[in-house]
Amino acid sequence: KLLQVSTIAMQQQEKLIQQERALLNFTEWKRSCALQMKYCQAFMQNSLSSAHNSSPCPNNWIQNRESCYYVSEIWSIWHTSQENCLKEGSTLLQIESKEEMDFITGSLRKIKGSYDYWVGLSQDGHSGRWLWQDGSSPSPGLLPAERSQSANQVCGYVKSNSLLSSNCSTWKYFICEKYALRSSV
């Protein structure tokens, strides 16, 4: 009789352990679901807010026609400037026309005054040709005014109304450019 009771007690204890395990699994599953829901909601929220917030340019960027520009508040060497722009889904500024150059220099005058700003222009070490980052050549009126006396790689920068050249390893502010979003209205 005693043996029978202890067997039943053991079975009950085993059942209890199984139920506790199941409850633990369920709690874990519920927590995981809640986390996933939170994650989904946050993702949806971000997507919705960026959809509602569909101004042509991100905050702190300046718009001119089809482009958005970001004027950095930090100094960096040319290569790091390039990477900083890529993080934002943009590239270093590529000046296509005199109108764009005038807009940039006018904006810089208003924002910061006469500082140096890296743009996406560099000089090929072998040929000495100036090229934009996508491999295209600048128009004749948009070539750096002075040839840098540097044995190192030479890159282009904007200062006041001019496009100039300097050793790419010097520290300057930089300007990023991306396309403005088209309004869907």
Epitope: Y39, L86, G89, T91
Partner: nanobody, 115 residues
């Protein structure tokens, strides 16, 4: 966390071609830019090419006119088409993704240009 899967490295003759591809995967992220760095033994890592989600392109001076970069935004995949290869292009090529979750790098794929 974003995982990057590179493929297409190998051995090529000088003047030959290779295409590298890299696919980014992971939980809910969006890619701002994707690109390729390379590192030859004993040299510094350099950015070879990158493309933004809008299709804006950045190329190193040493590869302009020879390499092209393209992407398939729907699949978070980037391709590096390398033509007119030179021995000095020999390096380990690393895929890189600048995403809303941060910046991620791949394991690298070896490219050797030799006759």
């Amino acid at each position: 966390q974003v995982q990057l899967q590179e493929s297409g490295g190998g051995l090529a003759q000088p003047g030959g071609s290779l295409q590298l591809s890299c696919a980014a995967s992971g939980r809910a992220f969006s890619t701002n830019s994707m690109g390729w760095y390379r590192q030859a033994s004993g040299k510094q890592r350099e950015l070879v090419a990158a493309i933004t989600s809008q299709g804006r392109i950045t190329l190193a001076d040493s590869v302009k006119g020879r390499f092209t970069i393209s992407s398939d935004n729907t699949k978070n995949t980037v391709f590096l088409q390398m033509n007119s290869l030179k021995p000095e292009d020999t390096a380990v090529y690393y895929c890189n993704a600048w995403t809303t979750l941060g910046t991620f790098g791949g394991q690298g794929t070896q490219v050797t240009v030799s006759s």
